[in-house]
């Protein structure tokens, strides 16, 4: 269930997709990836206020218990709901090859 | 990939399964759930230091970018990797029914 998509904290403050530009060096990939030399990493960043984009029943429970016991139970967290695949050109023992990674770039986000 | 299960922050400090006892009132369920009257909610709580239980490539990227840009990119977050189903006895318009929820109790945890 994609509960409330309205962010009560103000525009852009709640859980959503962000793009962060990163070099191979930033990612620690320079020794095994040849291309791309820079990655536009899409990731999920932002707050998860009550019922905002609650992924499932567990997220709703977490919201309730966080309200009751904030020192014990953390608020739900903004994480990928799905991913976009991406191809990397990489060095291997046998030479250069293509590898597609299905879990590299966030496609959309929810709170859990 | 379940990277490192050794917690560098000390025993029990990193992402793992916790059990939190909650009443129907705590959960806001008193008006529609009859049983159980108390739920042992299993949830994922704890820190996600570098590569600890990294769920996938995205989590590894997030760790690297958090190290570089801690104010922009949050650390990976401890969330359920899978769930245990749970049955609730609930009130309906037509009486009482059983309903199994597949996404209510965390079964195990990872960092993403």
């Amino acid at each position: 269930a994609r509960n409330g998509d309205h962010c009560p904290l103000g525009p852009g403050r709640c859980c959503r997709l962000h793009t962060v530009r990163a070099s191979l060096e930033d990612l620690g990939w320079a020794d095994w990836v040849l291309s791309p030399r820079e990655v536009q990493v899409t990731m999920c960043i932002g707050a998860c206020p009550s019922q905002f984009r609650a992924a499932n029943m567990h997220a709703q429970i977490k919201t309730s218990l966080h309200r009751l016991k904030p020192d014990t139970v953390p608020a739900p967290c903004c994480v990928p709901a799905s991913y976009n695949p991406m191809v990397l050109i990489q060095k291997t023992d046998t030479g250069v090859s293509l590898q597609t990674y299905d879990d590299l770039l966030a496609k959309d986000c929810h709170c859990i | 990939a379940r990277n490192g299960d050794h917690c560098p922050l000390g025993p029990g400090r990193c992402c793992r399964l916790h059990t939190v006892r909650a009443s129907l009132e705590d959960l806001g369920w008193a008006d529609w759930v009859l049983s159980p009257r108390e739920v042992q909610v299993t949830m994922c709580i704890g820190a996600c230091p570098s590569q600890f239980r990294a769920a996938n490539m995205h989590a590894q990227i997030k760790t690297s970018l958090h190290r570089l840009k801690p104010d922009t990119v949050p650390a990976p977050c401890c969330v359920p990797a899978s769930y245990n189903p749970m049955v609730l006895i609930q009130k309906t318009d037509t009486g009482v029914s059983l309903q199994t929820y597949d996404d209510l109790l965390a079964k195990d945890c990872h960092c993403i």
Epitope: L34, S35, P36, P85, M86, V87, L88, I89, L98, T100 | -
Partner: antibody, heavy 117, light 106 residues
Framework: QVTLKESGPGILQPSQTLSLTCSFS??????????VGWIRQPSGKGLEWLAN???????YYNSALKSRLTLSKDTSNNQVFLKISSVDTADTATYFC??????????WGQGTLVTIS | QIVLTQSPAIMSASLGEEITLTCSAS?????MHWYQQKSGTSPKVLIY???NLASGVPSRFSGSGSGTFYSLTISSVEAEDAADYYC?????????FGGGTKLEIK
């Protein structure tokens, strides 16, 4: 296993529009960094890059031919299409499509011969 | 556009000989690929990004260079190496290929 196969009319007359199809399998144009490129080769001559179409629908054309080229794709059916308008005998060549990963023609089709006469 | 000039246009080599094919760019490029095309077949990549051997390519092939000058070396020519060899740049659009070097085996 990645495979690509070009199909075209074989023969057509000057001034007509050449329509080529590249049907591929083993990869998806939904994958970031993935594209399909077209290259041609007149008999006994070298390779000439024509155009690329990318996962995000960006298109790049050889500037010398840009006004005559049109690229499109059908991602769900794993097909890419190239049209070349107003052909003449200089367009006689074997036309290849190739899988492009970022900057690399990684896999090529067998090519289809097109004769303008 | 960046023009790539390959030399020689035709090279004849004996089995076991070491040979070097060159590719000169009209302006500086960051990297160069090399493709091999045997008669009647489609091209396949040999060298990726100047010096990286593609998967499955024999180690007798190697690449080097920078700026405007790149080369492909075959340390010990074998009969199966008879083919056309093309350099390719993608540093700027339009992507371009060199005119090719035909390698014949004596």
């Amino acid at each position: 296993q990645v495979t690509l196969k070009e199909s075209g009319p074989g023969i057509l007359q000057p001034s007509q529009t050449l329509s080529l199809t590249c049907s591929f399998s083993g990869f998806s144009l939904n994958t970031h960094g993935m594209g399909v490129g077209w290259i041609r080769q007149p008999s006994g001559k070298g390779l000439e890059w024509l155009a690329n179409i990318w996962w995000n629908d960006d298109k790049y054309y050889n500037s010398a031919l840009k006004s005559r080229l049109t690229l499109s794709k059908d991602t769900s059916n794993n097909q890419v299409f190239l049209k070349i308008s107003s052909v003449d005998t200089a367009d006689t060549a074997t036309y290849f499509c190739a899988q492009v990963a970022w900057d690399w023609f990684a896999y090529w089709g067998q090519g289809t011969l097109v004769t303008i006469s | 556009q960046i023009v790539l000039t390959q030399s020689p246009a035709i090279m004849s080599a004996s089995l076991g000989e070491e040979i070097t094919l060159t590719c000169s760019a009209s302006s500086s490029v960051r990297y160069m690929h090399w493709y091999q095309q045997k008669s009647g077949t489609s091209p396949k990549v040999l060298i990726y990004s100047t010096s990286n051997l593609a998967s499955g390519v024999p180690s007798r092939f190697s690449g080097s260079g920078s700026g405007t000058f790149y080369s492909l070396t075959i340390s010990s020519v074998e009969a199966e190496d008879a083919a056309d060899y093309y350099c390719h740049q993608w540093s700027s659009y339009p992507w371009t290929f060199g005119g090719g070097t035909k390698l014949e085996i004596k």
